[in-house]
């Protein structure tokens, strides 16, 4: 059973390592894949002394942990590299860090990337 599923056909693309990887630096990436597989968008970034450095954004393969996530939100407490994934076209355009610990109240730090 799948409720309110949103298709993902394209995602915001960014690659900080674009010269070495020989890709574009930024753009829109069409998401390809098998008919029976779901597609998602993702973003990865680092927080270097309070400054946000985007590592990559783009399409993400079918992953059950991305299902039903309409917003790209990292919820892990203090990760080394931040990661989020979501469903819906260009849903990785904005991403945020919203650590949820078991006991303490969560705090929200939304991020709008400026590649």
């Amino acid at each position: 059973a799948i409720l309110g599923r949103s298709e993902t056909q394209e995602c915001l693309f960014f690659n900080a390592n674009w010269e070495k990887d020989r890709t574009n630096q930024t753009g829109v990436e069409p998401c390809y894949g098998d008919k029976d597989k779901r597609r998602h968008c993702f973003a990865t970034w680092k927080n270097i002394s309070g400054s946000i450095e985007i590592v990559k954004q783009g399409c993400w393969l079918d992953d059950i942990n991305c299902y039903d996530r309409t917003d790209c939100v990292e919820k892990k407490d203090s990760p080394e590299v931040y990661f989020c994934c979501c469903e819906g076209n260009m849903c990785n355009e904005k991403f945020s860090y919203f650590p949820e610990m078991e006991v303490t109240q969560p705090t929200s730090n939304p991020v709008t990337p400026k590649p």
Partner: antibody
Framework: EVQLLESGGGLVQPGGSLRLSCAAS????????MSWVRQAPGKGLEWVSG????????FYTDSVKGRFTVSRDNSRNTLYLQMNSLRAEDTAVYYC???????????WGQGTLVTVSS | QTVVTQEPSFSVSPGGTVTLTCGFN?????????PSWYQQTPGQAPRTLIY???TRSSGVPDRFSGSILGNKAALTITGAQADDESDYYC??????????FGGGTKLTVLG
Amino acid sequence: EVQLLESGGGLVQPGGSLRLSCAASGFTFRNDAMSWVRQAPGKGLEWVSGISVTGGSTFYTDSVKGRFTVSRDNSRNTLYLQMNSLRAEDTAVYYCAKVYYTSFFDYWGQGTLVTVSS
Amino acid sequence: QTVVTQEPSFSVSPGGTVTLTCGFNSGSVSTSYYPSWYQQTPGQAPRTLIYNTNTRSSGVPDRFSGSILGNKAALTITGAQADDESDYYCVLYMGSGIWVFGGGTKLTVLG
């Protein structure tokens, strides 16, 4: 420390019902997909069911479709498996497992034994 | 119906190297199936060894490594030890919320 504690197993007659629970602690339950995996005596592991973070998407192996229902209560940090119309071939240890990105099982419970026999 | 195949049993000498494989009947295993590997000793819950083809789970010794070999996923154990004697299961994520386990490989460490 991540802990998954299954309960609700036991002896039931063919055609009967059971509800398994998996109490989760040590992580933010509502942030992760979850799954049930079973192992019949002396046999290999078999994936049974999976559920997305919100519970909005649920999935089953063919042999349990229409008989088993997976659900979750994110306010209680608990995963459930409602098993109806049980058959002898459902006899197994049932494990709940936390699912992480790239869809792998990163933590497992110790399992609860379900025996279907008359 | 997708069937995931593993060698039913395998033997290795202490200190030796063994490669267990995981294939399936519908084509080639690729990284898009997120192959993962689990170790299980009798009476115990499975333990996660490798995920996303080749990433070692926390606390897993570097004697264990994962890869794609030809059209199969592979788990290689180098410098096998007595306590590596276990059952090993591979899992493929087929997408759309569905996983398929292999039948498992029973690894015997000789001696």
